[in-house]
């Protein structure tokens, strides 16, 4: 398996980190904009595909690494290209909040994709 050997972050740990970086925040990464993504098309890799383009923002790095570890676990994860809205850009904080909402829903319903 190409995945790292340390157990990947759990959904709960990802939720905790997303809560941590969004609470009481109006903006993240100096208001950087990223492509909007369809999180239903493999949420970890889809979110990573957009967020990987954010640099010089320590607040988001742990999230990026968590998503990378989770995306790396998926079969042929590197080959799947998620649906991305190339015409829609949103703020990093909005994408992170969207991801948090989506991941919470997945966690509640036990659908650990």
């Amino acid at each position: 398996s190409p995945s790292p050997v340390t157990p990947s972050p759990t959904l709960k740990e990802l939720i905790e980190e997303l809560v941590n970086i969004t609470q009481n925040q109006a903006s993240l990464c100096n208001g950087s904009m990223v492509w909007s993504v369809n999180l239903t098309a493999g949420m970890y890799c889809a979110a990573l595909e957009s967020l990987i383009n954010v640099s010089d923002c320590s607040a988001i790095q742990r999230t990026q690494r968590m998503l990378k570890a989770l995306c790396s676990q998926k079969p042929a994860a590197g080959q799947i290209s998620s649906e991305r809205s190339r015409d829609t850009k949103i703020e990093v904080i909005q994408l992170v909040k969207n991801l948090l909402t989506y991941v919470r829903g997945v966690y509640r319903h036990g659908n650990f994709r």
Epitope: P2, S3, P4, T6, L48, E49, I52, N53, S55, D56, S58, I60, Q61, R62, Q64, R65, K68, A69, C71, S72, A76, A77, G78, Q79, S81
Partner: antibody, heavy 118, light 107 residues
Framework: EVQLQQSGPELVKPGASVKVSCKTS????????IYWVRQSHESLEWIGYI???????TYNQNFKDKATLTVDKSSSTAFMHLNSLTSEDSAVYFC????????????WGQGTSVTVSS | DIVLTQSQKFMSTSVGDRVSITCKAS??????VAWFQQKPGQSPKALIY???NRYTGVPDHFTGSGSGTDFTLTISNVQSEDLADYFC?????????FGAGTKLELK
């Protein structure tokens, strides 16, 4: 200025273990992971990283039984313990950190040469 | 694991030339490729991240390009201090993997 200072060269016997240290300065130690990379015969291999914030580690499968990564937050120092050494483990080991782009190591230690020989 | 192939182990050049070093990924890594320069007895030096972004202080005659599986580091107007080993790194997926390197040498 971000700086990483590694411990000196090691000459060890087969079967022994060694602990390489990496003392950091110039930034907040818990903000960024410490990455470890091995260079032998010119090629570079990523060993893994440790996040000093929570002690979380991610290893390359190839090094899961060879390397153990730890940190001492009080001295802003990272350590890599290498066990059951063989001649194949003779290499230069680097620590590094990534500040600008996640997982792209732009600040490197000077390297620690580990030679395994009887 | 994602394999990065730097097909040319050695490249010969002359001062003032333009040279392109290539790196091919075994699968789609989007734009998550970085480039490093290493001189004998020194640590690697990061030049480029996310395929085309230069680190502060890196001369602008170093240019990165590409996405997906094919990436290029172009050095225009090669200087003698550019003679070194160049490695690519993919930072899309764990484990992070490096190319085997390309040594830039004088003709």
């Amino acid at each position: 200025e971000v700086q990483l200072q590694q411990s000196g060269p090691e000459l060890v016997k087969p079967g022994a273990s060694v602990k390489v240290s990496c003392k950091t300065s110039g930034y907040s130690f818990t903000d960024y992971p410490i990455y470890w990379v091995r260079q032998s015969h010119e090629s570079l291999e990523w060993i893994g990283y440790i996040d000093p914030y929570n002690g979380g580690t991610t290893y390359n499968q190839n090094f899961k039984d060879k390397a153990t990564l730890t940190v001492d937050k009080s001295s802003s120092t990272a350590f890599m313990h290498l066990n059951s050494l063989t001649s194949e483990d003779s290499a230069v080991y680097f620590c590094a950190t990534a500040v600008v782009a996640t997982d792209v190591m732009e600040n490197w230690g000077q390297g620690t040469s580990v030679t395994v020989s009887s | 694991d994602i394999v990065l192939t730097q097909s040319q182990k050695f490249m010969s050049t002359s001062v003032g030339d333009r040279v392109s070093i290539t790196c091919k990924a075994s699968q789609n890594v989007r734009n998550a490729v970085a480039w490093f320069q290493q001189k004998p007895g020194q640590s690697p030096k990061a030049l480029i991240y996310l395929a085309s972004n230069r680190y502060t202080g890196v001369p602008d005659h170093f240019t990165g390009s590409g996405s997906g599986t094919d990436f290029t580091l172009t050095i225009s107007n090669v200087q003698s201090e550019d003679l070194a080993d160049y490695f690519c790194l993919q930072h899309w997926n764990y484990p992070l993997t490096f190319g085997a390197g390309t040594k830039l040498e004088l003709k």
